[in-house]
């Protein structure tokens, strides 16, 4: 029951996380204009991974895609790649984990297969979460660098006339969404990996030969590496041999202090 709950919760947490990663990737507010001094232009700039937007004080908003691919910073391309890899891995992980859920029956799928699928999806969620966190962190680092550079060269002039007013940009909402979503996906992945341990059937019965000695009569049968004295089910010295070998499950043997292995 605890395993099912852990797996189910891991799935839900990862689902929320991946939804958050997708939302963050699509959001336009990765960086927003720092309103340290509102100049004469009553306009507010903000940027996403895919387009740059501007909002007028009247409420009018206009966004434009980054039409050039080569003119963009390599770091931005890296962030895009990390976020997309995170989404793709997360989506595959979700697909795998649906079939791995203990509460869902698909044909005669064994627990070992479900355990493997749970582990696979868990690892995928962990990597997905790490990709998102890395992507957002790289962008945040770019922002911090740009912020301090802008502060240093706030005004650059030619002949005493102010030519450029460096606009400073600060963390947008998408960064926080991305960090939280990446963290949730990571936690969900860890939970799936923990659930996998509980799902995996513990192989304690190694199919081999078992000898049951009881009084004078000895029964030979294939089974686990178990040697038992006659303190089991045959205490009345009855003949066990019935002309055929039995499996471990057919003869009920109770553990005793004389059992080996």
């Amino acid at each position: 029951m605890a395993v099912t709950a852990c797996q189910g919760l891991g799935f839900v947490v990862s689902l929320i996380g991946i939804a958050g990663i997708i939302a963050a990737t699509c959001m336009d507010q990765w960086s927003t204009q720092d309103l340290y001094n509102n100049p004469v232009t009553a306009v507010f700039n903000y940027q996403g991974l895919w387009r740059s937007c501007v909002r007028e004080s009247s409420g009018f908003t206009e966004c434009r895609g980054y039409f050039t691919l080569l003119g963009l910073p390599a770091m931005l391309q890296a962030v895009r790649a990390l976020m997309i890899v995170g989404i793709v891995l997360g989506a595959i992980g979700l697909l795998v984990s649906i079939f791995a859920l203990k509460c869902i029956r698909i044909g005669s799928m064994e627990d070992s297969a479900k355990a493997n699928m749970t582990l696979t999806s868990g690892i995928m969620f962990i990597v997905s979460g790490l990709c998102a966190i890395a992507g957002v962190s790289v962008f945040a680092n770019m922002l911090v660098t740009n912020f301090w550079m802008s502060t240093a060269n706030m005004y650059t002039g030619m002949g005493g006339m102010v030519q450029t007013v460096q606009t400073r940009y600060t963390f947008g909402a998408a960064l926080f969404v991305g960090w939280v979503a990446g963290g949730l996906t990571l936690i969900g992945g860890v939970m799936m990996c923990i659930a996998c341990r509980g799902l995996a059937p513990e192989e304690t019965n190694y199919k081999a030969v078992s000898y049951h000695a009881s009084g004078h009569s000895v029964a030979y049968k294939p089974g686990g590496f178990k040697a038992s004295t006659g303190f089991g089910s045959n205490t009345k010295n009855k003949k066990i041999y019935d002309g055929g070998a039995r499996t471990e499950d057919e003869v009920q043997s109770y553990p005793s202090k004389h059992d080996y292995v």
């Epitope: 960086s31 100049p39 232009t41 306009v43 700039n45 940027q47 740059s52 937007c53 501007v54 009018f60 206009e62 434009r64 980054y66 039409f67 050039t68 003119g71 963009l72 910073p73 931005l76 740009n146 802008s150 030519q163 450029t164 007013v165 460096q166 606009t167 940009y169």
Partner: nanobody, 120 residues
Amino acid sequence: QVQLAESGGGSVQAGGSLKLICTASRATDCNYMSWHRQAPGKEREFVSRIFPSGKTTYADSMKARFSISQDNAKNSVYLLMVNLKPEDTGKYYCQGSCRGPGSIWPSDYWGQGTQVTVSS
């Protein structure tokens, strides 16, 4: 570095008209372009703004007489001023919120300004 250059200023009689031109060089992309003016001994004030989509905004006092337009192919913005008055005298500055090469963050770039003198 993005550079803006204004031209088209000069002296004109009251009631006359002028067309100011602003050209942006080395700008990868501009979120908007605008015109501002500074009358002698006064603060710089906003005149008009144009977005890449063609949407325009004007200062209330100038809406009727001023008209902003753009030519995206030439990276240029124009300000047509008609029925000019002596109080329109001042230096007209072009401003653009543009991205330089290799950046995603626009900065406010300003031109050197062009002088407009309206005599009565």
